[in-house]
């Protein structure tokens, strides 16, 4: 492993459709991929009227958007389905939402970011 990189070997697995899909609802997923590729964890969830509904969690494949992210954070503003990815074993156990504010004209009343959601 390269120094400073948190290598992902396993992730929290969760499937909201577990009863219908007849899988385990939750567990630990071992992550595989090409030897020269990086591996990550991910989480997807929905915000239904302020209530967080996890969709799926598990291993994610080599993705530059996940590089060197130790925390699983969604930064898009109000996506249809929230998604975050990270590096490091089980790093998707907790996830949060910090939308990046678009900087336009500075105002006298700065906008406070929305609070994060944590699993």
């Amino acid at each position: 492993a390269i120094l400073g990189r948190s290598e992902t070997q396993e992730c929290l697995f969760f499937n909201a459709n577990w009863e219908k899909d007849r899988t385990n609802q939750t567990g630990v997923e071992p992550c595989y991929g090409d030897k020269d590729k990086r591996r990550h964890c991910f989480a997807t969830w929905k915000n239904i009227s302020g209530s967080i509904e996890i969709v799926k969690q598990g291993c994610w494949l080599d993705d530059i958007n996940c590089y060197d992210r130790t925390d699983c954070v969604e930064k898009k503003d109000s996506p249809e389905v929230y998604f975050c990815c990270c590096e490091g074993n089980m790093c998707n156990e907790k996830f949060s939402y910090f939308p990046e504010m678009e900087v336009t004209q500075p105002t006298s009343n700065p906008v406070t970011p929305k609070p994060p959601y944590y699993n």
């Epitope: 697995f13 499937n15 459709n17 219908k20 899909d21 007849r22 899988t23 385990n24 567990g27 997923e29 071992p30 992550c31 595989y32 997807t44 969709v55 799926k56 969690q57 598990g58 291993c59 994610w60 494949l61 249809e80 389905v81 998604f83």
Partner: antibody
Framework: QVQLVQSGAEVKKPGSSVKVSCKAS????????ISWVRQAPGQGLEWMGG????????NYAQKFQGRVTITADESTSTAYMELSSLRSEDTAVYYC?????????????WGQGTMVTVSS | EIVMTQSPSSLSASVGDTVTITCRAS??????LAWYQQKPGKAPRLLIY???HLQSGVPSRFSGSGSGTHFTLTISSLQPEDFATYFC?????????FGPGTKLEIK
């Protein structure tokens, strides 16, 4: 890199059963997510069901429920798909396929396919 | 069951063209959508997963987009080896269902 090698072609009578095997080589077989997909001649693709050997429980498409049994033998790194009460419309190529992840991102490694012909 | 439809069912194009294939789902599989290429007598090959992620080893002229219920596969600068049948597949919930396919032929 995982490789999937399937058993050879089969010719079966209507009403009988067929059992197709799929031997995996590569990383830990029990951690793979394996699906079975079939394709009738000149037709599209149809997902039949899947299994993660470490969990043991198979998941079947409603269409095949009661007629298909998917199992996995960890000792030989082999997955099996058995289809019973065969009819002519079951004539198809049957593929064993590995998924990228347990959350079913995509079917990335396919066996060579097994042609099953159902004919009286 | 999520029903997948594709359009067109077939199209003709020339080497160097850009083509777009559309896939629609009866219910939103979110982004759990994959695209496959299949040539006669061969097993399908995964091209795109999670609607827009290029599978390892697939040329960058293939791209995917969309979310919700509407997805597209675009092939830019068509090469002779790209003439094949293309399928979309949802893997949000079982049974995982495929589109009926789009046959891409040489004009």
């Amino acid at each position: 890199q995982v490789q999937l090698v399937q058993s050879g072609a089969e010719v079966k009578k209507p009403g009988s059963s067929v059992k197709v095997s799929c031997k995996a080589s590569g990383p830990r077989f029990q951690d793979l997510s394996i699906s079975w997909v079939r394709q009738a001649p000149g037709q599209g693709l149809e997902w039949m069901g899947g299994i993660i050997p470490i969990y043991g429980t198979a998941n079947y498409a409603q269409k095949f429920q009661g007629r298909v049994t998917i199992t996995a033998d960890e000792s030989t790194s082999t997955a099996y798909m058995e289809l019973s009460s065969l009819r002519s419309e079951d004539t198809a190529v049957y593929y064993c396929v590995k998924d990228l992840t347990w959350t079913n991102l995509g079917l990335d490694i396919w066996g060579q396919g097994t042609m099953v012909t159902v004919s009286s | 069951e999520i029903v997948m439809t594709q359009s067109p069912s077939s199209l003709s194009a020339s080497v160097g063209d850009t083509v777009t294939i559309t896939c629609r789902a009866s219910q939103g599989p979110s982004r759990w959508l994959a695209w496959y290429q299949q040539k006669p007598g061969k097993a399908p090959r995964l091209l795109i997963y999670w609607a827009a992620h290029l599978q390892s080893g697939v040329p960058s002229r293939f791209s995917g987009s969309g979310s919700g219920t509407h997805f597209t596969l675009t092939i830019s600068s068509l090469q002779p080896e790209d003439f094949a049948t293309y399928f979309c597949q949802q893997s949000y919930s079982t049974p995982f269902t495929f589109g009926p396919g789009t046959k891409l032929e040489i004009k």
